[in-house]
Interface confidence: low
């Protein structure tokens, strides 16, 4: 902004400047120029002298002690020397004049003191008017601007020295400039006085609810130029979380309810993600609605989600003691895609309907591909015991399971196992043989399950006899056999569902009889 110290165009009466010489040089006139009455000074020395030396001095211009630099703006008209009759103008015709100044702490009255004036510039017209312009009544005004720097006294005078130009000094304005109070980059900069030269760096103050950028450019700064212009903005303020730049860019306004702004890198307030809300203005995060959560590591920009419902349509298919469990994904995934499944196995006494006691399955039960963190809705189970009762529980979980008070989303199925796989692939093995007994064992049977009513039936035969024997364990001691005799043995399992198939026939031979020492005479 400009602070005017003197402006002749606003003068309501005569200016009364000092003229030297008092006559035949500069003279004050009131003229209508382009429709406006103005008090101006003219000098058009036509007397044909080579050494025209006309001076005009302003009144004392009070500067105060504020501005060390003032600006002068002249509006003037210079007549083209060629426009005079004859085309050459008077002898010594010039088209320039000189601007000078003198500092003083007080008004020195009517003493001109020419030697104390310092020249500022030679003022030249970039356009001069011709006879044609005079006839048409349109006078071209030239504007000259210059600056007076490093002023130290309380006031100054301007002087105009005319060495021979035909000139009209239409207006003279003396002013200094301040960089006005302004807003830039959400920062307020105070009204600032420029320095005597160069730029003055000024720190800005962030507007309410704004703070300086953490970037290298940092706190907002601007530079006040000698011409009163703010230049080279560096850095800026950003609305703090919960606020955004208003439409005019001159304030930070609170995010409306239902929206949020989490950090200064986000340009605007964002609508709350699904299943979340911001009740009040100025939210930095939207809180999840009841029953909805964000998983650890999910930022405020992510929609809130819920735990899944239970898996559906849990079914199984068994083959021997192998089992395949299948199910369908939950009807409600909670709005997430990271649903995982966990399978728990319990072995029970009695059927599920009996409600007998259950305990976790032993280490021999194996799940493929695993029992936890399953991404596909199926699992294979190996290592189950025949004729045992099992309950399988399948639970659906996602990234927000367990964050609230909701129960487990699971479904169960109870299964009574049937026959084991055929014993045809299993082998009877001889543990020990003697002349009259054989000790045998067979592979493939697992530790007996609680409550399972299983026995094994052995079929033993040789050329002379056939016998059947029941045992509870997968081993047997056959006694009262013939020495050095081959026996054919096979085994099968007897279950509540009936007998299983026999194993293949195995041949075992007892040891020869132990020879007793011969006694003499016999």
């Amino acid at each position: 902004k400009e602070v005017t110290l003197m402006d002749t165009s606003k003068a309501q009466g005569e200016l009364g400047w000092l003229l030297d010489p008092p006559k035949d040089g500069w003279s004050e006139q009131q003229q209508i120029l382009n429709g406006t009455p103005l008090y101006m000074y003219q000098d058009c020395p036509m007397q044909g002298r080579r050494d025209t030396d006309h001076w005009l001095r302003s009144n004392w211009i009070y500067r105060g002690e504020e501005a060390s630099r003032v600006h002068v703006e002249l509006q003037f008209t210079v007549r083209d020397c060629k426009s005079f009759p004859g085309g050459a103008g008077p002898l010594g015709c010039k088209e320039t004049f000189n601007l000078l100044y003198m500092e003083s702490d007080q008004d020195v009255g009517i003493q001109l003191r020419r030697p104390l004036f310092q020249k500022v510039t030679t003022v030249a017209a970039d356009q001069s008017f011709t006879i044609r312009d005079l006839v048409s009544g349109s006078v071209k005004l030239n504007v000259e601007r210059c600056s007076l720097g490093r002023l130290t006294r309380r006031g100054l005078y301007l002087a105009f020295h005319n060495p021979g130009a035909c000139v009209a000094l239409v207006s003279v304005r003396v002013f200094y400039q301040r960089c006005p109070e302004t807003l830039n980059g959400l920062a307020q900069f105070p009204d600032t006085l420029p320095g005597p030269a160069g730029l003055v760096e000024v720190a800005g103050t962030c507007l309410p609810h704004a703070r300086a950028s953490p970037r290298p450019s940092g706190a907002p700064r601007m530079h006040c130029s000698p011409d009163g212009e703010w230049l080279v903005p560096v850095g800026r303020c950003h609305c703090e979380p919960g606020y955004e730049e208003g439409g005019s860019g001159e304030a930070c306004v609170a995010c409306p309810s239902g929206s949020y702004r989490m950090d200064m890198d986000t340009p605007h307030c964002l609508t709350c993600p699904q299943q979340s809300t911001a009740e009040s203005e100025g939210a930095t995060i939207c809180t999840c609605e009841s029953g909805h959560y964000r998983a650890p590591g999910e930022g405020p920009q992510v929609a809130c989600t819920g735990p899944p419902s239970a898996p559906r349509n849990l079914s199984f298919s068994a083959s021997g003691t192998q089992l395949s469990l299948r199910w369908e994904p939950p009807a409600d995934t909670g709005g997430r895609q990271d649903v995982r499944y966990s399978v728990r196995c319990s072995q029970c006494q009695g059927t599920a309907q009996d409600g007998g006691p259950c305990q976790p399955c032993g280490v021999g039960v194996h799940f493929s591909p695993g029992a936890r963190g399953l991404t596909t809705p199926a699992v294979h189970v190996n290592g189950l015991e025949p004729y045992a009762n099992y309950t399988f529980n399948v639970e659906a979980q996602n990234g927000v399971s367990g964050l609230g008070s909701s129960g487990h989303a699971s479904t169960s199925v109870s299964i009574s196992m049937g026959h084991a796989e055929s014993l045809s692939g299993l082998s009877l093995r001889l543990v020990k043989k003697e002349p009259r007994q054989l000790e045998l064992t067979w592979a493939g049977s697992r530790p007996r399950s609680p409550g399972a009513n299983l026995t094994y039936e052995l079929h033993v035969l040789n050329q002379d006899e056939e016998r059947y024997q029941m045992v509870l364990e997968p081993r047997v001691l056959l006694t009262e056999l013939q020495p050095d005799t081959t026996y054919i043995v096979r085994v099968r399992m007897l279950t509540p569902l009936g007998p299983g198939p026999f194993s293949p026939d195995h041949e075992f031979r007892t040891s020869p009889p132990v020879s007793r020492g011969l006694t003499g005479g016999e």
Epitope: R236, P267, L270, T271, Q301, V302
Partner: antibody, heavy 121, light 106 residues
């Protein structure tokens, strides 16, 4: 790397509809808005609008309201442009482009390869 | 709606020469436009956005300047791969593109 993959060319009859998918990969789909840009044969670029991939809220440029619908399926990181009641003048290449928002100015920093939609009877 | 007018429509330059593309806004705009490059049969590519920031992978021979209503994209030394159509784009409540300047081999 960051990619926007659009479907192949479509030939449709006037009055029909077309749905152009734009599948994003290599970045968090919901972290950036998606713009749609039209380029008629031999012509310049026309901004059609954009969709906020977080809220699904679309913004349509002048001249692209009514028959043009932007939509999303965030579960498959895909934005869609549906044009109904197709006209011959809808024949153009349609681009999806990821928006880069900054405090100082915006631009579209990743573009799909474009889908040519030809409307002809 | 702000209209962007690009000139010239076609600019013929030789490789190694300087190319200056103009983009004029129908009214003063508060920020510099973004600039894009498009080669035949390809999608546009972002060159410059924001405060004359080059996009990732854009060589430093591309620069932008201007303010108010007059903006310029300068290619300091045109390389063979720079022959393409260039678009300026302003942002605000609605985005608009200029009609494009084709840079062709002289």
């Amino acid at each position: 790397q960051v990619q926007l993959l659009q479907s192949g060319a479509e030939v449709k009859k006037p009055g029909a509809s077309v749905k152009v998918p734009c599948k994003a990969s290599g970045y968090t789909f919901t972290s950036r808005a998606m713009s749609w840009v039209r380029q008629a044969p031999g012509q310049g670029l026309e901004w059609m609008g954009w969709i906020n991939t977080n809220t699904g809220n679309p913004t349509y440029a002048q001249g692209f309201t009514g028959r043009f619908v932007f939509s999303l399926d965030t579960s498959v990181s895909t934005a869609y442009l549906q044009i109904s009641s197709l006209k011959a003048e809808d024949t153009a290449v349609y681009y999806c482009a990821r928006v880069r928002l900054t405090v100082y100015g915006d631009g579209m920093d990743v573009w799909g390869q474009g889908t040519l939609v030809t409307v002809s009877s | 709606e702000i209209v962007l007018t690009q000139s010239p429509a076609t600019l013929s330059v030789s490789p190694g020469e300087r190319a200056t593309l103009s983009c004029r806004a129908s009214q003063s705009v508060s920020s510099n436009p973004a600039w894009y490059q498009q080669k035949p049969g390809q999608a546009p590519r972002l060159l410059i956005y924001g405060l004359s920031t080059r996009a990732t992978g854009i060589p430093d021979r591309f620069s932008a300047s201007g303010s108010g209503t007059d903006f310029t994209l300068t290619i300091s030394r045109v390389e063979p791969e720079d022959f393409a159509v260039y678009y300026c784009q302003q942002y605000g409540p609605s985005w608009t593109f200029g009609q494009g300047t084709k840079v062709e081999i002289k």
